[in-house]
C-alpha cells in the first residue's frame, strides 16, 4: 500500500500537464491576499528641523487580491527536465477587506528626495538637484494617497529633473501589466526530489546582487517543495520580492481543515548579522549603516532596486538589532503578527497555507547639499510600509486532498 | 600635472555662433565633473555652464537665457561650448575647469580662450 | 539667489603685513564659501574650499574662517608672489555667485 501511495505521489506531484500539481502550479486554486499597513509620520517638521525621533503610525489594512493570475509562457525542456514561466502581476482592490479607499491620504518620506543624494553622492550633483527640489516644493516628507504610494504618481521634483529619467515613483511602481521572471524549474521527471526547485531566474543561475554563495538562487519559490518533507529539513526558496534566496525551519505541527501539515517558520538567525551568523556575511555589503556589519534585521537590497536605498526588514523591525529601530518610535513588534511562516503537507510537500511578512524601509541620510535633509544629525531607515501576503487552501480543495492524499494513508 | 586646453576663441560679429573645445590630458577625465567659466573685461567671473562626468545632468544659470550648450566626449577627454546667438556682453575669456575628487567646483583652469563678439 | 558682498575692491599692502580680505552672503550658506587667486596674464587657482580647507600645496600663509554670511580670507605675512586678484565663491546653492573680486596690490 504504501509503495503505491508513494508511487502515486510522484506521479502527482511532476509539473506536467495531466497531474495535480500541474494544474494547481500554473494557476493557484488559493485565494491569495495582501494586506498592506503604512506607517503615517506623525512628527515631519519635527523630524526635517531638528532630527528628532520619527514618530509613526501605522494604518491599515489595506487588501489587494493577488496572484490571481495563471502563469504565462509555459514551456516543458525534455532535454533538462525543466518547465520554464513567468508569473504575471496583478492587484485588485478590495475594499471590504480593507479600513479606507484607496484615495486615503498618508504622511510619508519623500522617496525621490531621499534617494536622490545616495545615487548621486557628488556635490555638483546635489546642488543640482537641490535647486529642483525647491524649484519643486518637495521637501523631506510628502502627503500622498496609498494607491500613489503604492502603484505610483508623477515626481514633481523628478519631472524637473534635465535628462531622461523614469519621473514616476511608487513603492511597488511598476506592478500591474508586469512579470516576475522568466522562471525555469526542475518539473521533477526524471528526480522527483528536486521538483519545483529553481534551476534559473531571469536566464541565470546567480543574482548578480551579492558576493559569494549570497548570490545563489536556492530552493523553489515556496508554493511547493520536493514531497515527503521531513522535520529535520531545512526548507529553501528564493523570494524574487527580497531579492535573495531564504530557508525556513520545523516550528510545529498543526491541522489545517482536517490535514496535517508541518509549519515551518523563518528563523531570526536568517536575519542575524554575520557575528552572531556568520553565514550572513555575503548579505553586508555596506559598512556604515550597518555600524561595521554588527546590525540586524535589515537587509540592504539596493543593488537590486537601480541604486535606490531601499532595505527590507521583517514588520515593525521583529528581530532587528536596537540601532535600526531606536529612532523609530510607534513601533511595536510581535513574533506572531510580524514573522513569516509556511504550512507544507509533508507527503506531497505542497504550501496549504502561508503569510508572508516583510517591510519595505528607505534609507535617508543627512546630505548638507540638500536643503530638504541637511538638519538630520543621523541617518534613518525609515520603515514606510508593512505587507502580509496569506493564502490558505479553500474548503472544498481540504476536502478533495484529504479524499485524495491523506484520507488514502491513514 | 592637469593640464587643460581650450581653443575656438576669436573674434566674432554679434548673433554669430562658435564652438570652444577644452581638451585634457588626464586618464581619469570621464570620472570628474567639469565647467566652463568666465572673466569678463569689468575683471568679473562667471559660471557658464557645468556638466557632470557622464554628461547625464548639466546646468545653466537663467542668466545665460540657454543660448550656450556644454557637452563632453569623454573618449577624446575633450569639454565642449557651443555658444549661439553671440551677443557684446558674452565678450570674455573663457576658461574650462575640472570640479575636485570631492566635488569641489573648479579645482583646476585651463590658460582660458579669449572670445570677442564686436560689430 | 545668493548674492555676495566682497570687500575691499582693491588693496595696497607691504610685504609682511596682514592681509586680509571680507565676502558677505546674502543668505546662510554653511560653510561653503571658496577663495580663488588669480595672478596677471594666468588662470584662477583655488586656494580654499569648502569647509575652510586649504588645497595640498597652498602655502598655510593662506588661511579662512567663516560660517552661515560671514566670511574672511587672510594671507598672515604678505610676499610679493601674493600679488594677485583674489575672488570668493559660494557654493552651496545655484546660481553659484562670484564676489567681484579684491585687487591685492604692493605698497
Known amino acids: 500500500g504504501d509503495m503505491l501511495i508513494e508511487k502515486t505521489i510522484k506521479r502527482e506531484v511532476v509539473l506536467e500537464e495531466g497531474t495535480t500539481a500541474f494544474k494547481n502550479w500554473v494557476k493557484t486554486g488559493t485565494t491569495v491576499y495582501r494586506q498592506f499597513w503604512i506607517f503615517d509620520v506623525q512628527n515631519p517638521d519635527d523630524v526635517a528641523k531638528n532630527s528628532s525621533k520619527i514618530k509613526v503610525k501605522q494604518r491599515g489594512p489595506y487588501t489587494y487580491r493577488v496572484r490571481y493570475l495563471a502563469k504565462e509562457n509555459i514551456t516543458q525542456d525534455p532535454e533538462d527536465h525543466t518547465v520554464s514561466f513567468v508569473q504575471p502581476n496583478g492587484a485588485i482592490f478590495e475594499p471590504s477587506l480593507s479600513v479606507g479607499t484607496e484615495d486615503d491620504n498618508f504622511t510619508v518620506l519623500n522617496l525621490a528626495v531621499a534617494a536622490a543624494p545616495h545615487i548621486y553622492q557628488n556635490s555638483f550633483v546635489q546642488v543640482v538637484l537641490n535647486s529642483l527640489i525647491k524649484k519643486s516644493k518637495s521637501s523631506m516628507f510628502q502627503t500622498r494617497s496609498l494607491k500613489e504610494l503604492l502603484w505610483g504618481y508623477k515626481d514633481p521634483f523628478l519631472s524637473l529633473v534635465p535628462y531622461p529619467i523614469s519621473t514616476t515613483v511608487g513603492v511597488f511602481y511598476p506592478y500591474n501589466d508586469t512579470v516576475d521572471g522568466v522562471y525555469k524549474v526542475f518539473n521533477g521527471k526524471d528526480n522527483i526530489s528536486k521538483v519545483a526547485i529553481i534551476e534559473s531566474y531571469k536566464g541565470k543561475r546567480n543574482l548578480s546582487y551579492w558576493p559569494s554563495y549570497c548570490d545563489m538562487i536556492n530552493g523553489t519559490d515556496a508554493a511547493s517543495f520536493p514531497p515527503f518533507v521531513e522535520k529535520s529539513r531545512t526548507l529553501r526558496f528564493f523570494s524574487s520580492d527580497i531579492c535573495r534566496s531564504i530557508y525556513a525551519v520545523f516550528g510545529s505541527e498543526i491541522d489545517l481543515k482536517g490535514i496535517p501539515v508541518y509549519r515551518f517558520v523563518l528563523p531570526a538567525n536568517a536575519f542575524a548579522s554575520p557575528l552572531q551568523n556568520p553565514d550572513n556575511h555575503c548579505f553586508c555589503t555596506e559598512k556604515v549603516i550597518s555600524n561595521n556589519c554588527t546590525s540586524y534585521g535589515v537587509l540592504d537590497i539596493g543593488k537590486c532596486k537601480e541604486g535606490k536605498p531601499v532595505y527590507i526588514s521583517l514588520p515593525h523591525f521583529l528581530h532587528a538589532s536596537p540601532d535600526v529601530s531606536e529612532p523609530i518610535e510607534g513601533l511595536h513588534p510581535n513574533e506572531d503578527e510580524h514573522r513569516t511562516y509556511l504550512d507544507v503537507e509533508p507527503i506531497t510537500g505542497f504550501t496549504l497555507q502561508f503569510a508572508k511578512r516583510l517591510q519595505v524601509n528607505i534609507l535617508v541620510k543627512p546630505a548638507r547639499k540638500i536643503e530638504a535633509l541637511k538638519n538630520l544629525k543621523r541617518p534613518y531607515i525609515v520603515p514606510i510600509l508593512w505587507l502580509n501576503e496569506t493564502g490558505t487552501i479553500g474548503d472544498e480543495k481540504a476536502e478533495m486532498f484529504k479524499t485524495q492524499v491523506t484520507g488514502k494513508i491513514k | 600635472e592637469v593640464q587643460l586646453v581650450e581653443s575656438g576663441g576669436g573674434v566674432v560679429q554679434p548673433g554669430e555662433s562658435l564652438k570652444l573645445s577644452c581638451e585634457s590630458n588626464?586618464?581619469?577625465?570621464?570620472?570628474?565633473?567639469m565647467s566652463w567659466v568666465r572673466k569678463t573685461p569689468e575683471r568679473r567671473l562667471e559660471l557658464v555652464a557645468a556638466i557632470n562626468s557622464d554628461g547625464a545632468i548639466t546646468y545653466y544659470p537663467d542668466t545665460m537665457e540657454r543660448r550656450f550648450i556644454i557637452s563632453r566626449d569623454n573618449t577624446k577627454k575633450t569639454l565642449y561650448l557651443q555658444m549661439s546667438s553671440l551677443k557684446s556682453e558674452d565678450t570674455a575669456m573663457y576658461y574650462c575647469?575640472?570640479?575636485?575628487?570631492?566635488?569641489?567646483?573648479?579645482?583646476?583652469w585651463g590658460q582660458g580662450t579669449l572670445v570677442t563678439v564686436s560689430a | 539667489e545668493t548674492t555676495v558682498t566682497q570687500s575691499p575692491a582693491s588693496l595696497s599692502m607691504a610685504i609682511g603685513e596682514k592681509v586680509t580680505i571680507r565676502c558677505i552672503t546674502s543668505t546662510d550658506i554653511d560653510d561653503d564659501m571658496n577663495w580663488y587667486q588669480q595672478k596677471p596674464g594666468e588662470p584662477p587657482k583655488l586656494l580654499i574650499s569648502?569647509?575652510?580647507t586649504l588645497r595640498p600645496g597652498v602655502p598655510s600663509r593662506f588661511s579662512s574662517s567663516g560660517y552661515g554670511t560671514d566670511f574672511v580670507f587672510t594671507i598672515e605675512n604678505m610676499l610679493s608672489e601674493d600679488v594677485a586678484d583674489y575672488y570668493c565663491?559660494?557654493?552651496?546653492?545655484?546660481?553659484?555667485?562670484f564676489g567681484a573680486g579684491t585687487k591685492l596690490e604692493l605698497k
Open positions: 588626464e586618464y581619469e577625465f570621464p570620472s570628474h565633473d
Open positions: 575647469a575640472r570640479h575636485g575628487q570631492t566635488g569641489t567646483w573648479f579645482a583646476y
Open positions: 565663491l559660494q557654493s552651496d546653492n545655484l546660481p553659484l555667485t
Open positions: 569648502e569647509g575652510n
